[in-house]
Structures are given as C-alpha cells and as structure tokens.
C-alpha cells in the first residue's frame, strides 16, 4: 500500500499540517453518491493540493476529487461501498498523507425539512413533524433523529429528544406558557451505516398559549 | 507482505485465564479493525469479537461478553484477547484475522491451540 | 442472531465439472445493492482464506473460477471448473448485523 510506513510506530511520522476529515453522502444526487473533504486547519495553503480516492470503486481504480473553494468533492456511482478505500492528499503526484476510509463510516444524512409544529387544543399537545429525503432513498433509510427545542430566551439551555419517526407530541404541561420556543431537528445513520449529524434544519418557532383555567379555577 | 503471526499452543486448567497475542506487519496497523474467530475441533467458525487499534474501541459477540477482553499494543504492532473462567467448551483454535471491511476477513493468523483441561 | 444454513454439507464433483453451494440466511444481510455475504476457503490444518466478498467480489488473488452471486436471503459459491486442489470446507459468513455468524460449512471433495 504506496506511500504507508510498514508499521504502527512510524505512522505518526505523516505530515500532520495536511490532517483532514471526510463525510459521504449516498444518493445525494439521484443515484450519485458524493465524498467531501477538507483540512482540518482552515489555514493550510489548498494552492497545487489534490485529493485523490483509490480502491473500493467500481469499474476504475482512482479517482480525482474536484476542488470547490476550499473542499475537495467528488459526485459519482462508482463506490462500492464494501472494503476501505485509500484517501490521499498529493502534490504533484506524490502523496503527503493517506487514510484508509470505509465510506460506510463516515456517512453524512441530509438535513431534515419542513419542519413545523401544530398545537392541539383539545388535547392540550404540539405535534411535531418534519421530512427527510432519506425515506425515499435506498441506503441509508434508517436514521436516528435529535429534535432540540428551547425557550427564545434560554440561549443554551436545549431540551432534546431522540426518535427514530419523523412524528414527536411535546405535551403543553411540560412547556412554559405563553413563550416562544425555538425547535430544530438533525439525523444521523442509524442502521448499518455510521458516519455523522446532518445540518440541522431550519429552526421553526411557535408559541405556547396561556394557561386556560377551567371554570371555578382561580388565578393564583 | 501483509502477516499476522499469533502466539504458540496453550494448556490451561478449568477456571483459570489465557491471553493469545496476534501481531501484525506489512501494513499501517492502525488502518484495519482486527478480529478474533474460534475454531472448536471439527466444527465451524464463531466471532468472538473485534478491536479498533486506532481508538482502541471494542465489540465482542454478546455470548463471549463479561469473560473476553481485547487489547492492543501500537508500539509493538499488537493486539491481545484474553478470555477468563475457562471450561472445557472452550478447547479451540483461535483465529486473529484483519477485517478488509465491514466485516469480512481478509486476513488470518495461522491459529492458536487453547485447550482446557483438569 | 442471523443463522446461516449451507447446503449441501458435502459433496464430490469429478475435476473439470462444476461444484455450486448455497447459503440461506434466516433475515436479509442485503441493503438495496449491498449485499453483506462473504465466503471462505479452509484446507485442513490451515486457517481459513477469504474467497469472495460482497456476495459477488472476487478477493485479489483468488482465481476466477470461484464466483459468487444472490442478493437478500439467498447466496451462492460457484465453483467451475473445479480443480483437484479446491478440496476444501467453505463457508459463507454474514456482516450486516452483530454478531458476525458464519454457516455450519460445506465438505468439497474432488473425485
């Protein structure tokens, strides 16, 4: 395996200035699968880095990744999605640092969508729901999903719940009354493949009502 | 070449402990997960479980779990199963192989005779 | 667990002729065109050698008249045209969901 020390004690002696991180994104595009990279040090000079994949690929050996900015990018249906394959940032032909990567690893979900939140009165609920495009794909179909909501003023104080179904009630009683609350949802593979959060949506505010008492309650 | 060269027989009495080594050379260690397979004479093959020598992250078959403990060695290009509390059951030959994905073995040491017995 | 049943346990094929076993699996070990399904050669006193993985991948270094193919419960090894040296156990072995089993094996033997 070219440009790999023949042992773990050497391994360290890569360059760490070119360290980088990967995340795939299967039929992102269609049937099309995507692979992003990036260096970890935003600073690193990109000028003459190229970001090349071999092995675990159909029908070709290696591939070049295309550079937008400052991420590295492929968009093909050429990965096998068995075995690893080698990632190597190179100049001029020779490479400065190489990972072995199992693309099933590092899998990155879509963010969720549409997003939005119905209170019920009779009930005295809000149910939440929102979309994903991983329903309709025919990998990655099963995902674990982070619903995180707060009171607007609350900055860091999230609630999150976790779900695997794209449908959560939050009862009235649990929520502070007449607030505006703030809710978001991400995704992360959840069956066989490994990998990443998504993006998180768009947040989507609502607005809790005032406590209704019943007839012959008084106000505290 | 790509090798993993495993530690030689043992004979253990019930109830006591074994630690079989696995070390491998001709490839960066740290890049392939590395399994541990038990033979019992005349049968077929059973995972015990896998290790991580990047992380050191583990995952043992749930039958094996509370008496099976796999380490590993970077320094030294290793990794380690020790299995505990010893029984007659498990009189094996134990197999290190390299997972060339997830999981499939495409690598293997040459085995380890474990056998237990008073 | 996923069980792995192989079929048949033995058999004899003369050399030159074709030798085929199947693996029957009690769930699914396939997503869409992945299909978690590998198989193994073991000569006696010898640990055993991956053959094919991905149902369909010939390991590099293993000669192609060993095939695989099947996709969901159903995979098969195919050996064709066989040789005197391919008398061997092989077994199949499943990875989409732990723990890892392997089927109960099959006896070639070449006559």
């Known amino acids: 395996e070219s440009g790999y020390a023949q042992n773990g004690d050497l391994e360290d002696a890569e360059l760490d200035d070119y360290s980088f991180s990967c995340y795939s994104q299967l039929e992102v595009n269609g049937s099309q699968h995507s692979l992003t990279c990036a260096f970890e040090d935003p600073d690193v000079n990109t000028t003459n880095l190229e970001f090349e994949i071999c092995g675990a690929l159909v029908e070709v050996k290696c591939l070049s990744f295309r550079k937008l900015q400052e991420i590295y990018f492929i968009e093909t249906k050429k990965f096998l999605l068995i075995g690893k394959s080698n990632i190597c940032v190179k100049v001029g032909g020779k490479s400065l640092t190489c990972k072995k990567i199992d693309l099933t690893t590092i899998v990155k979900p879509e963010a969720p969508f549409d997003l939005s939140v119905i209170y019920r009165e009779g009930a005295n609920d809000f149910v939440v729901t929102f979309n994903t495009s991983h329903l309709q794909k025919k990998y990655v179909k099963v995902l674990m999903h982070d619903v995180a909501y707060r009171q607007e003023k609350d900055e860091n104080k999230w609630m999150h719940v976790n779900l695997s179904s794209t449908k959560l009630t939050l009862l009235q009683r649990n929520l502070q009354p007449e607030a505006m609350y703030e809710i978001k949802v991400r995704s992360i593979p959840d069956h066989y493949f490994k990998g990443f959060w998504s993006e998180w949506s768009p947040s989507y505010y609502f607005r809790t009502p005032e406590i209704n008492n019943s007839p012959g309650e008084m106000d505290p | 070449q790509v090798q993993l060269v495993q530690s030689g027989a043992e004979v253990k009495k019930p109830g006591a402990s074994v630690k079989v080594s696995c070390k491998a050379s001709?490839?960066?260690?740290?890049?392939?997960?590395l399994h541990w397979v038990k033979q019992a004479p005349g049968q077929g093959l059973e995972w015990i479980g896998g290790?991580?020598?990047?992380?050191?992250?583990?995952a043992y078959n749930q039958k094996f779990k509370g008496r099976v403990t796999m380490t590993s060695d970077r320094s030294t290009s290793t990794v380690y199963m020790e299995l505990s509390s010893l029984r007659s059951e498990d009189t094996a030959v134990y197999y290190c192989?390299?997972?060339?994905?997830?999981?499939?073995?495409?690598?293997w040491g040459q085995g380890t005779t474990v056998t237990v017995s008073s | 667990d996923i069980v792995l049943t192989q079929s048949p346990a033995s058999l004899a094929v003369s050399p030159g002729q074709r030798a085929t076993i199947t693996c029957r699996t009690s769930?699914?070990?396939?997503?869409?065109?992945?299909?978690?399904m590998h198989w193994y050669q073991q000569k006696p006193g010898q640990p055993p050698k991956l053959l094919i993985y991905?149902?369909?991948n010939l390991e590099s270094g293993v000669p192609a008249r060993f095939s695989g193919s099947g996709s969901g419960t159903d995979f098969t090894l195919t050996i064709n045209p066989v040789e005197a040296e391919d008398t061997a156990n092989y077994y199949c072995q499943q990875s989409i969901k732990d723990p890892y089993t392997f089927g109960g094996g099959t006896k070639v033997e070449i006559k």
């Open positions: 192989a390299r997972s060339g994905g997830r999981w499939y073995f495409d690598v």
């Open positions: 769930e699914s070990v396939s997503i869409h065109l992945l299909h978690l």
């Open positions: 290790i991580d020598p990047k992380t050191g992250g583990t």
């Open positions: 001709g490839y960066r260690f740290t890049d392939y997960e």
């Open positions: 991905g149902a369909s």
